[in-house]
């Protein structure tokens, strides 16, 4: 675009240099050239000469009219054809922009990733505005009434050091651009309720060489949160459908989870956790791939079978990934597995 240009005249835009996309726009060019009575005044958009809808208003001024201007950005300049000059003479230039007022930000979510020292707030911005749009995040203490504000483009990280006067806050986001302003709905936040445990990691897996081979998955987290609820999902690499197992975890030691899987198959495992009774989940851990060993026993064990004597029914989901790019968006199907209660041992054996 044109940042600084020495004008020999003026150029102005109605309704303004930033306007709503789809509006009719008039751009005026007024020359103030010395030693020139221009035969013609010409308009250029993005370097290309315009041919239509140009009106000569008087000796010094011309106008170009655009019906329903819908380009996000354009740079305009105008020139004069001066008698006796081989080249056209530049009069002036302007950057113009069209866009939309912002939508009200939606789906505002704030979380504290354990050990991060920040509260991270995200939101949906809505439809593209095509023009510079800023977001003002308001954080108001419900105890002291003090309000803090933070400027952001798409999300914000707020140091928990600046949130020490209170535990309860009201958070909302204001979207602002040249064409308008909208507020999100307000979100009530209690700092103790939005902590997401430190990342869970699957460290290794092994398949035993028993008559009934079982796969043991080892996983851990550095979380200091005592009560944690987790999900582990798994599937063969050739399958679209995940099986999901739920359980409570205590990360003072490495977790061990047992699975009875199809032999000679490649499985993918992922885990995620949340503080028990809270609503914010970790993202799924990185995929962990494990190859089960070839079948040695005579009996063909099914994935849902369990060797435990004492069993309680546990509902587990099967989820079908809609897209490999969106692993979080799934279609829920119902299934049932059994959760065994081993007689001894302080780790969690789950069949």
């Amino acid at each position: 675009g044109i940042t600084s240009i020495n004008c020999s005249g003026d150029m102005w835009v109605e309704p303004g240099e930033i306007f709503q996309m789809g509006m009719n726009v008039s751009i005026y060019c007024q020359e103030a050239l010395k030693h020139c009575r221009p035969r013609n005044l010409y308009f250029y958009k993005n370097g290309f000469k315009e041919e239509f809808d140009i009106t000569r208003i008087n000796r010094t001024t011309a106008r170009i009219w655009y019906k329903g201007f819908s380009e996000p950005h354009a740079y305009m300049h105008c020139t004069a054809e001066c008698p006796g000059h081989f080249q056209e003479t530049l009069i002036c230039g302007k950057d113009i922009s069209s866009g939309h007022p912002p939508d009200a930000p939606s789906n505002l979510t704030c979380v504290i990733y354990e050990y991060s020292g920040n509260m991270t707030c995200t939101w949906n911005t809505g439809k593209p505005t095509y023009i510079d749009t800023k977001y003002i995040v308001h954080v108001k203490s419900l105890e002291t009434e003090e309000e803090q504000q933070y400027l952001a483009s798409s999300y914000v990280k707020i140091s928990t050091d600046s949130l020490q006067g209170s535990r309860k806050y009201l958070v909302w986001v204001q979207a602002v651009n040249s064409l308008g302003m909208e507020n999100s709905q307000q979100l009530h936040v209690h700092l103790d309720d939005i902590v997401i445990p430190s990342a869970s990691i699957i460290s290794r897996a092994e398949t035993t060489n028993d008559t009934v081979p079982k796969t043991i998955v080892y996983w851990k987290s550095k979380t200091m949160i005592e009560k944690v609820f987790c999900e582990m999902r798994y599937k063969t690499t050739t399958n679209q459908t995940w099986s999901v197992k739920e359980f409570d975890a205590n990360f003072t030691y490495v977790q061990q989870s047992e699975f009875y899987l199809e032999p000679d198959s490649k499985y993918v495992f992922q885990v995620r956790c949340q503080e028990t009774g809270k609503r914010n989940w970790q993202p799924w851990s990185s995929p962990f791939v494990h190859q089960t060993s070839q079948e040695t026993g005579k009996r063909n064990w099914q994935p849902w079978s369990s060797p435990f004597v004492h069993q309680t029914s546990q509902t587990v989901s099967q989820v079908t990934a809609k897209s490999s790019h969106e692993p979080q968006k799934m279609e829920m199907l119902s299934a049932t597995i059994f959760r065994g209660h081993p007689a001894s041992g302080n780790h969690q054996d789950i069949g």
Epitope: I136, Q148, Q149, Y150, L151, S162
Partner: nanobody, 116 residues
Framework: QVQLQESGGGLVQPGGSLRLSCAAS????????MRWVRQAPGKGLEWVSG???????IYADSVEGRFTISKDNAKNTLYLQLNSLKTEDTAMYYC??????????GSQGTQVTVSS
């Protein structure tokens, strides 16, 4: 209570520069977002620029690229550097708490006059 005192205004020619200051007291300045607003003769209040506690800034289209907002937490002072001044920048300038909005809380303001 919250106190804000603007200074630094004056008479300047078109194309000239000024630096406005706003001395703040009565609140935790380092955690506060601040803004400048102005009122031209016979016109309503107009928001000019804002800054949050981390130094992120936002400007009105009419001053973008010419004005610069900043804050010095050690001195509890907000600044507005005005460059390439135009006659239409002539106004009373006020500082206020909060990033955005065309209101102020009754401070005295500082007059900027741009004239040849």
């Amino acid at each position: 209570q919250v106190q804000l005192q603007e200074s630094g205004g004056g008479l300047v020619q078109p194309g000239g520069s000024l630096r406005l200051s706003c001395a703040a007291s009565g609140f935790t300045f380092r955690l506060s977002a601040m803004r400048w607003v102005r009122q031209a003769p016979g016109k309503g209040l107009e928001w000019v620029s804002g800054i949050d506690s981390r130094g992120s800034t936002i400007y009105a289209d009419s001053v973008e690229g010419r004005f610069t907002i900043s804050k010095d937490n050690a001195k509890n002072t907000l600044y507005l550097q005005l460059n390439s001044l135009k006659t239409e920048d002539t106004a009373m300038y006020y500082c206020a708490q909060g990033v955005y909005g065309d209101t102020y809380s009754g401070s005295q303001g500082t007059q900027v006059t741009v004239s040849s």
